[in-house]
Amino acid sequence: APVPPGEDSKDVAAPHRQPLTSSERIDKQIRYILDGISALRKETCNKSNMCESSKEALAENNLNLPKMAEKDGCFQSGFNEETCLVKIITGLLEFEVYLEYLQNRFESSEEQARAVQMSTKVLIQFLQKKAKNLDAITTPDPTTNASLLTKLQAQNQWLQDMTTHLILRSFKEFLQSSLRALRQM
């Protein structure tokens, strides 16, 4: 499911409950995706010992995964709500190609991988409604994404395992950083 249980507009199981605000809905959506990532990481960590490796040992890779930096305005120091929101949305859009790559990488968690991908699309929509400066958001080029996907899928098995691990870890860190920032807004 692309949204957490109880979030669907058709869900009327709890009429006494206050409808969630935009911020609460975004918060809950991120936590839902993080739970999904956690389940996917369990499968990858059971298959290899990469999860025990230090970040330094895995730093040498050609992946250009989105990462929060001081200049993005999402940290406590130098916090800037508008700049940060643009970074979060841009970063999520950039992660979409990597989430597409993950789709055929799981045996027992295939549905979970799909849920993470679809939930991220919903999260982007939620955030775009919140953002005032949509013009500043750059959408990745579809042709570039297609060739990147082909390149990633052509890697040998070990590199594909490494790529899967790095995508999940980076996406988790990006979402955690995003959540911390959104909770300051």
Epitope: S38, S54, K55, L179, R180
Partner: antibody, heavy 118, light 110 residues
Framework: CQSLEESGGRLVTPGTPLTLTCTAS????????VTWVRQAPGKGLEWIGI?????ETAYATSAIGRFTISKTSTTVDLKMTSLTAADTATYFC??????????????WGQGTLVTVSS | AYDMTQTPASVSAAVGGTVTIKCQAS??????LSWYQQKPGQRPKLLIY???TLASGVSSRFKGSGSGTEFTLTISDLECADAATYYC????????????FGGGTEVVVK
């Protein structure tokens, strides 16, 4: 066996800068968040700050500008400036396993005592 | 700013009895609350996280409950070894806060 150990605590005079170091054994700190907490004699726990990745930090309002946390793969430093007698406390570092979104500290060092006195 | 208020400051009960400690957040923190036990001269020990999940190796006599702004730690079948100070800690947001921890509750076992 995984453990944390703080070092660098000593008697200093007011205004002297001091750096405390938290060292990990049995695991790499690069995979975890690390927080600093202090406890004045006979008082409760006071949260100081946390370091997430290599460069994202958050601090308690009273620590902003005076305390700085930095990280390598094996250590986390707490740099303290403009120390006063009110900073006299046992300083603990603690690990957050960073697997979720909420901060919780499941591995603690034994603490290092900092005494600020003239 | 997610201030944590813990009550009472001190509580006393007999061996075999039950004590209840309350923790109140100034704003909703979902279920993102942990409880710690600290004995004199020792480091704190994580007991409960996510309001009600027992940390590894912690006795089931410790029970956490609550959500939003109101939380409770209940210790049943009190043992002498439970004599300690207990702290709640919000893990919802560590930005622009004075302290993530509550003021602490001393539990005296008679």
């Amino acid at each position: 066996c995984q453990s944390l150990e703080e070092s660098g605590g000593r008697l200093v005079t007011p205004g002297t800068p001091l750096t405390l170091t938290c060292t990990a054994s049995g695991f790499s700190l690069s995979n975890y968040y690390v927080t600093w907490v202090r406890q004045a004699p006979g008082k409760g726990l006071e949260w100081i700050g946390i370091i997430y990745g290599s460069d994202e930090t958050a601090y308690a309002t009273s620590a902003i500008g005076r305390f700085t946390i930095s990280k390598t793969s094996t250590t986390v430093d707490l740099k303290m400036t403009s120390l006063t007698a009110a900073d006299t406390a046992t300083y603990f570092c603690a690990r957050d396993d960073s697997s979720d979104w909420d901060a919780k500290f499941n591995l603690w060092g034994q603490g290092t005592l900092v005494t600020v006195s003239s | 700013a997610y201030d944590m208020t813990q009550t009472p400051a001190s509580v006393s009960a007999a061996v075999g009895g039950t004590v209840t400690i309350k923790c109140q957040a100034s704003q909703s923190i979902n279920n993102e609350l942990s409880w710690y036990q600290q004995k004199p001269g020792q480091r704190p020990k994580l007991l409960i996280y996510r309001a009600s999940t027992l940390a590894s190796g912690v006795s089931s006599r410790f029970k956490g409950s609550g959500s939003g702004t109101e939380f409770t730690l209940t210790i049943s079948d009190l043992e002498c070894a439970d004599a300690a100070t207990y702290y709640c800690q919000q893990g919802y947001s560590l930005r622009n806060i004075d302290n993530a921890f509550g003021g602490g509750t001393e539990v005296v076992v008679k």
